[in-house]
Every structure is written in structure tokens, then in C-alpha cells.
Interface confidence: low
């Protein structure tokens, strides 16, 4: 008789999840000299230990502490780029602007980017059929708690001027319920962070509106100002040109507004 299995609302663990995490870890440590000391098998064991045999709606930040310890990494605190709902452009940017970092440019962010995972209470199995959905099932699921934990730590590490890339095509350019809005904004340290600079990325080529005046951006400014952090905002009207000018700042067309 097949054993009853909890059916969750979200997609199951990514296929070949253990192999993917291990392979990504090996690749990352090969590319990043300062992380060559990391033992990827230990990283996988700590990752697995955070959710295997545990109820996937009862995961805590403490469960991830062994993994956090193994993945401890120093990034230049004044070169942090946060993003919300515009991951691809943020990653293209840091590929070109080599000394800036998104969370996914760190070991732990790189390991988990775009992956889903969960286990089952009291069994050592990984659930490849379904995992809890944040809204429909529970918020304390393995994936959500992981990103909340690493995002908090990443924001806490930031200093000086912190940049955030926001999607100007969305109805809520700043969304209080996003990871940026619910975790990162509240964990920037006012004693270390002088300014949060938002880059609002425009979607349409003919869109010349000042999206820095959007009500949700004003809401972000209010939240940040109340935390004694300065706020500034820039419209990026031409994301394609923006990237090109990051690659080639000497280009004559890059002196005009982008």
C-alpha cells in the first residue's frame, strides 16, 4: 500500500537537487579564490540538514545556521546591489560591473538561485512531488526561510551607498511584500548605510515618465527616511543603453541621460 504523502500547492523539489547544489558549489569555489577553502560536501550536508526529516511548514532560521556558518563570505559592503522583481537585469549588471554584488553572486545565493526544495517530517526523503506554497500553504517553508535568512544577512552586511534595482513596469514598483520590501529594507543598518539609491528600470522605450514620483517609491522613501537612511532615486529610461554604458563608459552617447 503506498504511503500517504502530503500534497502541497507548490512545485516539488527541483530535479537532481542534491547534484545541482553540489555541482554549483564546486563551480563557485573554483571561480572564487577566497572560497576555495570551502568543503562542498560539508556544505551539502549542512543544506540537507536544514530541511530533511523536518516538517516543511515548520522550518526556522536556526535550521539554516550550520549552512550560514559554512557559507560565511565577505563581500565589499559598499558594493551591494539589491533588486526586486528584476533579477535578470541585476545579474547582467553585476556580470559587467565586476566589483558589485547581488545576493546571487555570493556562494549561498548562487547555490539556491531558481531552485525549490523540501523534505517530509520523519523521513529522510526529499519531496519531488510538491512543496509548500508561501501563500497557499505556509510561509515557514524551506525555500522561503532560506531566502529570508540569507537576504537578512546580506542587507545587514551592507554599508555606505546601497543600490536597489526596481522594476518600473510593475503596478507596485516597490512592493512591501517582496523580499526587498519585507526583509532587506528593514535590515539595512543605519549606522553603516548612508544612502539607499533606487534605480527604477523603465520597460517601454517611449516611457518618459518620472517613475521616482510613483506613490510606492514615495512609500519606500518614507520607510527609509524613518530609519535615518538617506534616499535617492534615478530613472533608467533605457536599460539596454544603461548596460552598454556600464560596459563602455567612454562611449560618447553615454553622457546623455539613460
Amino acid at each position: 500500500v503506498p504511503r500517504w504523502r502530503q500534497q502541497w500547492s507548490g512545485p516539488g523539489t527541483t530535479k537532481r537537487f542534491p547534484e545541482t547544489v553540489l555541482a554549483r558549489c564546486v563551480k563557485y569555489t573554483e571561480i572564487h579564490p577566497e572560497m576555495r577553502h570551502v568543503d562542498c560536501q560539508s556544505v551539502w550536508d549542512a543544506f540537507k540538514g536544514a530541511f530533511i526529516s523536518k516538517h516543511p511548514c515548520n522550518i526556522t532560521e536556526e535550521d539554516y545556521q550550520p549552512l550560514m556558518k559554512l557559507g560565511t563570505q565577505t563581500v565589499p559592503c559598499n558594493k551591494i546591489l539589491l533588486w526586486s522583481r528584476i533579477k535578470d537585469l541585476a545579474h547582467q549588471f553585476t556580470q559587467v560591473q565586476r566589483d558589485m554584488f547581488t545576493l546571487e553572486d555570493t556562494l549561498l545565493g548562487y547555490l539556491a538561485d531558481d531552485l525549490t526544495w523540501c523534505g517530509e517530517f520523519n523521513t529522510s526523503k526529499i519531496n519531488y512531488q510538491s512543496c509548500p506554497d508561501w501563500r497557499k500553504d505556509c510561509s515557514n517553508n524551506p525555500v522561503s526561510v532560506f531566502w529570508k535568512t540569507v537576504s537578512r544577512r546580506f542587507a545587514e552586511a551592507a554599508c555606505d551607498v546601497v543600490h536597489v534595482m526596481l522594476n518600473g513596469s510593475r503596478s507596485k514598483i516597490f512592493d512591501k511584500n517582496s523580499t526587498f520590501g519585507s526583509v532587506e529594507v528593514h535590515n539595512l543598518q543605519p549606522e553603516k548605510v548612508q544612502t539607499l539609491e533606487a534605480w527604477v528600470i523603465h520597460g517601454g522605450r517611449e516611457d518618459s515618465r518620472d517613475l521616482c514620483q510613483d506613490p510606492t517609491i514615495k512609500e519606500l522613501e518614507s520607510i527609509i527616511s524613518k530609519r535615518n537612511i538617506q534616499f535617492s532615486c534615478k530613472n533608467i529610461y533605457r536599460p539596454d543603453k544603461f548596460l552598454q554604458c556600464v560596459k563602455n563608459p567612454e562611449d560618447s552617447s553615454c553622457t546623455s541621460e539613460i
Partner: antibody, heavy 119, light 106 residues
Framework: QVQLVQSGAEVKKPGASVKVSCKAS????????MNWVRQAPGQRLEWMGY????????EYNQKFKDRVTITRDTSASTAYMELSSLRSEDTAVYYC????????????WGQGTTVTVSS | QIVLTQSPATLSLSPGERATLTCSAS?????MYWYQQKPGQAPRPWIY???NLASGVPARFSGSGSGTSYTLTISSLEPEDFAVYYC?????????FGQGTKVEIK
Amino acid sequence: QVQLVQSGAEVKKPGASVKVSCKASGYTFTNYWMNWVRQAPGQRLEWMGYIIPSTDYTEYNQKFKDRVTITRDTSASTAYMELSSLRSEDTAVYYCARYPYRGYAMDYWGQGTTVTVSS
Amino acid sequence: QIVLTQSPATLSLSPGERATLTCSASSSVSYMYWYQQKPGQAPRPWIYLTSNLASGVPARFSGSGSGTSYTLTISSLEPEDFAVYYCQQWSTNPWTFGQGTKVEIK
């Protein structure tokens, strides 16, 4: 272990072109950018450009933009640097150097290829 | 382009002495990188992101600085430290190097 092995010394006449190769081994070629740097006798190091092997994206020092072309053959794990319209001041040792792209130094360098431009 | 000027051009010191090499940038840069080069050899990475020692570099080396002024310090010179040191910046294309400081035996 990581190795970058460059092609042998070249003697060229002014106006000619030279193509230097750099064969990588001991690591995944597409995971690292490949830079080209030259050093004229008694002079400082001079960065010429790089290629991202995984995407074929190149970026050049404007000084060489019209004369230098950096290419790669991923199947052979080899990068190439071609410099055209050679002049005597291009006489230098040319190095390839791999770069991990996240704020680090160029960590492994080829042995260097001496290019002499003389009539 | 950003011009990097190293001083002094030559530093004549004895083993055991402290060496201070400076690199001045014509415009502010985010970080400085340093390479060591010995005669007939390719440069070797020495310091990255201003203050991080590359793999295998002894702890007697240190790097510091910000903006337009950066320093490489050798607390107590060993015979193998005598070489040319180049600073380099990645902040603005073209990536540029200093003219080098030669640390020679007095």
C-alpha cells in the same frame, strides 16, 4: 594544475599582423574571462582587452580598438589575440591572463610571447 | 583614462627592513590590485580588492587605502621579496597599471 601555454616568439615587419594563441588547461575554460596584457621593454604593463569565453563578449582598450581582435575556440580551450598594422612600438612581450570576474586579480598568466616588429 | 603613479620608482632596502610602496590614482578608484614580477617571469597576483592577499602570499604583506591613494606594505623584507611591484585598477576602462616600484637589495 592550471596552465596557460602561449605560442612561440614572432618576428614581424611593420604593417603586418600577428596572432598569438593561449591554450588553457586544468580548469573549465568558459568559467573565466581571458585578458591580454603586453609589456614593452622596460615599460609598464598595458591591458589590451578581454574575452568572456562563455558568451564571446569582448571589451578592448580604446588605444587598440581598431587594431586588436580577441577570439576564442571553446572546443580547443584556446584564446587568440590578433594585432594588425604592426609598428615598432608594438615590440613587446604579450601575456594572456585568466580572470575570475568578481573583483579579483588576474590569477594565472601565460609564459608570455615575444613579438618583435622590425624592418 | 585613470593614470596610476607609483612611488618611489626604486626602493633600496636591506632584508628585515620595512617597505612602503604607494600608488596614486588620477581619479578615485574602488579598489586597488597589486602584482609582483621578477625578471624573465610573468606577473603574479599579490593583493586584490585593496587588502586581500592572493593565494600563497606571506602575511608580512598588507594592502590599504581608498579613493586615490593606496599602499602596499612589507613589514620585514625577506630575500624573495625583492622584485618589481605593479598596482592596477579595474574601476574604469581601460584597466591600467602603474609604472612599477622596484624593490632592490641595498
